[in-house]
Interface confidence: medium
């Protein structure tokens, strides 16, 4: 789903407040909910009638530093005799998201959010037919 | 996917740095890649042969402020009749994501990464079956 | 056929350090989370600690926070339990588990025989 | 943390009992609950993962059941191998955790 842009008021301070010096923000240390895990089906990605596979991204000046992302196996779907029937489609489903981006030089250290699109799975779908007038 | 806790070294200086007052870090304003969109097929949720309905919560003091989240609408799957078949399984794909939670107090303002469980959509999975040894 | 292999155990004085590692085999040791486990003779069982496929996800108990670390060396098939600072109460039998799935949170579907850490003076 | 409490901590049974062992949740685990099976000197066994799904090679005399907080495992008909200690364990959040067992033994 859609983050909204961010040049608005979330991250500044009231109006009657000083503003922020030199353009950042303070970030606590920590994590709310941070013990929350997912919990999916296992083998959800090969027992869908579109089946996808996972690729793992690595970026230790990210956070998380390992994003998945997953890719559609099939243009069609599995059908009940697990052949590919391309009479349907396998589509991707998307998801916006946040990492945090460290930068450093020496040892001033920043931080940054960066938007992330990520492949979650894949879901089965009717084509769109197009009815021409 | 897992987000990781965050006991460890991504927000700590190196240790030959004078350690981060106060327990707080320095977020820059602005975000990377804010305009990047999610790009899926039109009307997928109700398309897919596992169709859900989607919840937007909304909080003003979190960002993005809207979080949207999906729920299956069968437990089964919508077959090529458009009858739902319970011999396949409509089940969630879920997601971990970042958002930034706001706290003020007058013109104290801090910031705090959170960790929320999205469920992004639903795939139709053929049910586990167990053949005994 | 996935086995799991422990080994590193043995007797120490507490305060001392232990590196415990458990060999994998048959199956793809990076695409999945590992953890370790621990129990002490006759008693239930603990979870000590979870490190996600590529390392860069590591999970603690409360119990061992600050004293064990978690690691795993993917060309090696070997995950890793360094334990420092010992206590009497980390005597126990440690289990290496393997996730049973790739994405999420899962249960243990393939154990190895474990290794016996015993702390004492 | 979540706690799980099981009961009871120990049952005697006869062969061709049906056996039921409970396990409590101190706050809602969604569908991520399993049940391990454990004999003297040897490592766990998964028997059911996802409260209900049985593990492949396990009998389908062992089913689980339940949902949020409470769950159950049963065995239909108890069979001289199944004396053991039984464990339940949850995987919503960390710390993962388990119950405290249930021993299962001969009347």
């Known amino acids: 789903r859609k983050i909204p842009k961010v040049g608005h008021t979330f991250f500044q301070k009231p109006e009657s407040c000083p503003p922020v010096p030199g353009g950042s923000m303070k970030l606590d240390i920590g994590i709310i909910n941070e013990n929350q895990r997912v919990s999916m089906s296992r083998n959800i990605e090969s027992r869908s009638t579109s089946p996808w596979n996972y690729t793992v991204t690595w970026d230790p000046n990210r956070y998380p530093s390992e994003v998945v992302q997953a890719q559609c196996r099939n243009l069609g779907c599995i059908n009940a005799q697990g052949k590919e029937d391309i009479s349907m489609n396998s589509v991707p489903i998307q998801q916006e998201t946040l990492v945090v981006r460290r930068k450093h030089q020496g040892c001033s250290v920043s931080f940054q959010l960066e938007k992330v699109l990520v492949t979650v799975g894949c879901t089965c779908v009717t084509p769109v037919i197009h009815h021409v007038q | 996917r897992k987000i990781p806790k965050v006991g460890h070294t991504f927000f700590q200086k190196p240790e030959s740095c004078p350690p981060v007052p106060g327990g707080s870090m320095k977020l820059d304003i602005g975000i990377i890649n804010e305009n990047q969109r999610v790009s899926m097929s039109r009307n997928i949720e109700s398309r897919s042969t596992s169709p859900w309905n989607y919840t937007v919560t909304w909080d003003p003091n979190r960002y993005p402020s809207e979080v949207v989240q999906a729920q299956c609408r069968n437990l089964g799957c919508i077959n090529a009749q458009g009858k739902e078949d319970i011999s396949m399984n409509s089940v969630p794909i879920q997601q971990e994501t970042l958002v930034v939670r706001r706290k003020h107090q007058g013109c104290s303002v801090s910031f705090q990464l959170e960790k929320v469980l999205v469920t992004v959509g639903c795939t139709c999975v053929t049910p586990v079956i167990h053949h005994v040894q | 056929e996935v086995q799991l292999l422990e080994s590193g155990g043995g007797l120490v004085q507490p305060g001392g350090s232990l590196r415990l590692s458990c060999a994998a085999s048959?199956?793809?040791?990076?695409?999945?989370?590992m953890s370790w486990v621990r129990q002490v003779p006759g008693k239930g069982l603990e979870w000590v600690s979870a490190?996600?496929?590529?390392?860069?996800?590591?999970f603690y108990a409360d119990s061992v926070k600050g004293r064990f670390t978690i690691s795993r060396d993917n060309s090696k098939n070997t995950l890793y339990l360094q334990m420092d600072s010992l206590r009497a109460e980390d005597t126990a039998v440690y289990y290496c588990?393997?996730?049973?799935?790739?994405?999420?949170?899962?249960?243990?579907?393939?154990w190895g025989q474990g290794t016996t850490v015993t702390v004492s003076s | 943390d979540i706690q799980m409490t099981q009961s009871p901590s120990s049952l005697s049974a006869s062969v061709g009992d049906r056996v039921t062992i409970t396990c409590r949740a101190s706050?809602?685990?969604?569908?991520?609950l399993a049940w391990y099976q454990q004999k003297p000197g040897k490592a766990p066994k998964l028997l059911i993962y996802?409260?209900?799904s049985l593990e492949s090679g396990v009998p389908s005399r062992f089913s689980g059941s339940g949902s949020g907080t409470d769950f159950t495992l049963t065995i239909s008909s108890l069979q001289p191998e199944d004396f053991a200690t039984y464990y339940c364990?949850?995987?919503?959040?960390?710390?993962?955790?388990f119950g405290g067992g249930t021993k299962v033994e001969i009347k």
């Open positions: 588990a393997k996730d049973d799935r790739r994405i999420a949170a899962g249960s243990f579907d393939y």
């Open positions: 048959g199956f793809t040791f990076s695409s999945y989370v």
């Open positions: 490190i996600s496929g590529r390392g860069g996800n590591t």
């Open positions: 706050q809602g685990i969604s569908s991520a």
């Open positions: 996802d409260v209900s």
């Open positions: 364990q949850q995987f919503n959040s960390y710390p993962l955790t």
